[in-house]
């Protein structure tokens, strides 16, 4: 069964029970290349930071290549998704409880800014793929994802016919496409200038305070 | 590099049938569907149907129903199309081609015409 | 029998614009392919989905749709551009694919 974030009563700054996080965010000097806009306060390590950038990484044996070569401009995105899942300490208010045997929690229904969720998209539907989920249905016996027999790879347009049929299909609904822009302050951004701070701590204080007006709101 | 090369030109008789080939290399064979598609002289492109190489699914042509079959080899990476009852009207050029996307066919073998002439 | 439907013959003056059209039912619920075949050779595609090109294809080539009409554009034509040009499109019922009678493009 799964709890609702409310469930928590530590909805910011904290890390995910899950498979690579940390327990305890905190500064991480060295964290590589397009993970490193978390360097002030992250939930993620240097190494797995390291090792995410990898082709079919260590940490989830996850192979981006699945249907031939994936193109660049479009697996920068999934490095970024990557960064913000694994390193991100504002996620707290969209965290729920799973029954997995790989993690306890994951995030359900993030508001993704929609530039975000429409850039990947567009730099992506020329890829290709075979799944329109890929949280499940793969074939692992190898160790490693491949397409499940009879799965063809086809453009990721033809999987995901629109950006949040590719954000919110893609990952179970971790994210849900939000109808804010950019520098709201009312949705996530996965990509970021840590120069001017992490927008995303507004982000979070925003949402966990809605949460707190709307759990108090049912108990009277 | 992703080639399609498809087998030599073939003279037919009416009735007969004819079994095009098609080999495919430098992709995984079984992760992309395979159409047929002919061109009789100077006429447009004619679709015939598809082959899920990874299942041996298949999908043809009201047209060409019953008079075609489409087939597989995996080990071979070698996708088929046989056309029976041949007529000289089946005269054509005889494509196979790499589906992406329903339709949108990126690579095309060079094309094995078939002559049909009693 | 589903069909799309293209004008036989289009010519454009080397270096303008030109657009090579299909109509047709199937249109309206799904993307047009775009193939140049010149003689003798098997078809290229030069436009797939939204408005993509494949890698290869000047980016003078561009698609567009509106409707039951999908629109192939060449901006700037140059004559090694002339060529017939067939359009095609899925049929979502059966997933059968449908092609257009093609355009032969001449440019003068």
């Known amino acids: 069964t799964m709890c609702s974030a409310q469930d928590r009563t530590d909805l910011l700054n904290v890390c995910m029970d899950a498979k690579h996080h940390k327990t305890k965010p905190g500064p991480e000097d060295k964290l590589h290349d397009q993970c490193s806009p978390w360097k002030k306060n992250a939930c993620c390590t240097a190494s797995t930071s390291q090792e995410l950038h990898k082709d079919t990484s260590r940490l989830y044996n996850f192979n981006w290549d699945h249907c031939g070569k994936m193109e660049p401009a479009c697996k920068r995105h999934f490095i970024q998704d990557t960064c913000l899942y694994e390193c991100s300490p504002n996620l707290g208010p969209w965290i729920q409880q799973v029954n997995q045997s790989w993690r306890k929690e994951r995030f359900l229904d993030v508001p993704l800014c929609k530039e975000d969720c429409q850039r990947w998209w567009e730099d992506c539907h020329t890829s290709h793929t075979c799944k329109s989920n890929w949280h499940r249905g793969w074939d692992w016996t190898s160790g490693v994802n491949k397409c499940p027999a009879g799965a063809l790879c086809r453009t990721f347009e033809s999987y995901f016919p629109t950006p949040a049929a590719l954000c919110e299909g893609l990952w179970s609904h971790s994210y849900k496409v939000s109808n804010y822009s950019r520098g709201s302050g009312r949705c996530i951004q996965m990509w970021f200038d840590s120069a001017q701070g992490n927008p995303n701590e507004e982000v979070a204080r925003f949402y966990a305070a809605a949460m707190h007006v709307n759990a108090g709101e049912m108990l009277h | 590099e992703v080639q399609l090369v498809q087998s030599g030109a073939e003279v037919k008789k009416p009735g007969a049938s004819v079994k095009v080939s098609c080999k495919a290399s430098?992709?995984?064979?079984?992760?992309?569907?395979m159409h047929w598609v002919r061109q009789a002289p100077g006429q447009r492109l004619e679709w015939m149907g598809w082959i899920n190489a990874g299942n041996g699914n298949t999908k043809y042509s009201q047209k060409f129903q019953g008079r075609v079959t489409i087939t597989r080899d995996t080990s071979a990476s070698t996708a088929y199309m046989e056309l029976s009852s041949l007529r000289s009207e089946d005269t054509a050029v005889y494509y196979c081609a790499r589906d992406i996307s329903y339709g949108s066919f990126d690579y095309w073998g060079q094309g094995t015409l078939v002559t049909v002439s009693s | 029998r589903p069909e799309l439907t293209q004008d036989p013959a289009v010519s454009v003056a080397l270096g303008q614009t030109v657009r090579i059209t299909c109509q047709g039912d199937s249109l309206r619920s799904n993307y047009a392919n775009w193939y140049q075949q010149k003689p003798g050779q098997a078809p290229v595609l030069v436009i797939y989905?939204?408005?993509n090109r494949p890698s290869g294809i000047p980016d003078r080539f561009s698609g567009s749709s509106s409707g039951n009409t999908a629109s192939l554009t060449i901006t700037g034509a140059q004559a090694a551009d002339e060529a017939d040009y067939y359009c095609d499109s899925r049929v979502s019922t059966g997933n059968h694919v449908v092609f257009g009678g093609g355009t032969k493009l001449t440019v003068l």
């Open positions: 430098g992709y995984t064979f079984t992760s992309y569907a």
């Open positions: 989905g939204q408005n």
